[in-house]
């Protein structure tokens, strides 16, 4: 998350600039923590303070965006349902999974329905 402007090398915040191109947040030491993100626009350059969370689970962070299918049916056995996501966009240096599977508990209503279905099938 970008914090306050740290240093403006050329130009100033007041200068008109149509489109800034921002580089990745690079931690000052190690792989996470406080660092800087560099931006350029024409002849102007800015550095803003940013932070890479140390507990970031990269596959599911803002680094990786997925397009998800609809949730599958509730599995009465596990009490969960699953959906699959296909990678839509990754930050340039983010090593994202091509596809991910997400599970969540079924709502009590769907759980009951799934159990009822299972019971019927056994008869």
């Amino acid at each position: 998350v970008a914090k306050k402007k740290d240093k403006v090398k050329k130009g100033g915040p007041g200068s008109e600039c149509a489109e800034w191109a921002w580089g990745p947040c690079t931690p000052s030491s190690k792989d996470c923590g406080v660092g800087f993100r560099e931006g350029t626009c024409g002849a102007q350059t800015q550095r803003i303070r940013c932070r890479v969370p140390c507990n970031w689970k990269k596959e599911f962070g803002a680094d990786c965006k997925y397009k998800f299918e609809n949730w599958g049916a509730c599995d009465g056995g596990t009490g969960t349902k699953v959906r699959q996501g296909t990678l839509k966009k990754a930050r340039y240096n983010a090593q994202c999974q091509e596809t991910i599977r997400v599970t969540k508990p079924c709502t009590p209503k769907t759980k009951a329905k799934a159990k009822a279905k299972k019971g019927k099938g056994k008869d």
């Epitope: 990745p24 560099e38 350029t40 990754a90 340039y92 240096n93 983010a94």
Partner: antibody
Framework: QVQLVQSGAEVKKPGHSVKVSCKAS????????MNWVRQAPGQGLEWIGM????????ILNQKFKDKATLTVDISTSTAYMELSSPRSEDTAVYYC??????????WGQGTLVTVSS | EIVLTQSPATLSLSPGERATLSCRAS??????LHWYQQKPGQAPRLLIK???QSISGIPARFSGSGPGTDFTLTISSVEPEDFAVYYC?????????FGGGTKLEIK
């Protein structure tokens, strides 16, 4: 596996724009950054910019901000790079490459653009 | 922009020898450094990504080290097909930049 096939060589007069295409087949075209790189005869590699097909986010090398325009056509899985008002110093082989930090990249075969009067 | 300086410009070796190619960044770029091989008339080919990560299909004799500002590509025992130009590239900040290249030639 991604295959990138680029359009054929072009010879242009100075000032006449040129558009190079890069058609992708194989894995999902829309998920990965498409880079454009050029190489002048006998020289090294120079990054022009990149575009993400999912939303057309574009990051250009400032050196090329008035020179190159990057676009994509999702329906045909094709990326384009247009050079406006090229000069003789823009004579180079232009490459497209599809980048994934997880699996690496795939490159097109290159397109030679010759600008000569 | 980040400047990458490769050395030596030319490296003359015989097949079977060990090759050590260097790439120095003008500022720290973490591990965001990649190595490419290019042969005449061909597109570059990615050998190593993120300083030391191997690429599927690339022989195990190619290895890389980093991170920080000083990076090395090592070819443990040079094969005849390895004679080519090698480029490093950084993806730490825009614009992406390449080193000037190291030509590995037969002694």
């Amino acid at each position: 596996q991604v295959q990138l096939v680029q359009s054929g060589a072009e010879v242009k007069k100075p000032g006449h724009s040129v558009k190079v295409s890069c058609k992708a087949s194989g894995q999902s075209f829309s998920s990965y950054w498409m880079n454009w790189v050029r190489q002048a005869p006998g020289q090294g590699l120079e990054w022009i910019g990149m575009i993400h097909p999912s939303d057309s986010e574009t990051i250009l090398n400032q050196k090329f901000k008035d020179k190159a325009t990057l676009t994509v056509d999702i329906s045909t899985s094709t990326a384009y790079m247009e050079l406006s008002s090229p000069r003789s110093e823009d004579t180079a082989v232009y490459y497209c490459s599809s980048w994934s930090a997880k699996r690496g990249d795939f490159w097109g075969q290159g397109t030679l653009v010759t600008v000569s009067s | 922009e980040i400047v990458l300086t490769q050395s030596p410009a030319t490296l003359s070796l015989s097949p079977g020898e060990r090759a050590t190619l260097s790439c120095r960044a003008s500022e720290s770029i973490s591990n965001n450094l990649h190595w490419y091989q290019q042969k005449p008339g061909q597109a570059p080919r990615l050998l190593i990504k993120y300083a030391s990560q191997s690429i599927s299909g690339i022989p195990a004799r190619f290895s890389g080290s980093g991170p920080g500002t000083d990076f090395t590509l090592t070819i443990s025992s040079v094969e005849p097909e390895d004679f080519a130009v090698y480029y490093c590239q950084q993806s730490n900040s825009w614009p992406l930049t390449f080193g000037g290249g190291t030509k590995l030639e037969i002694k």
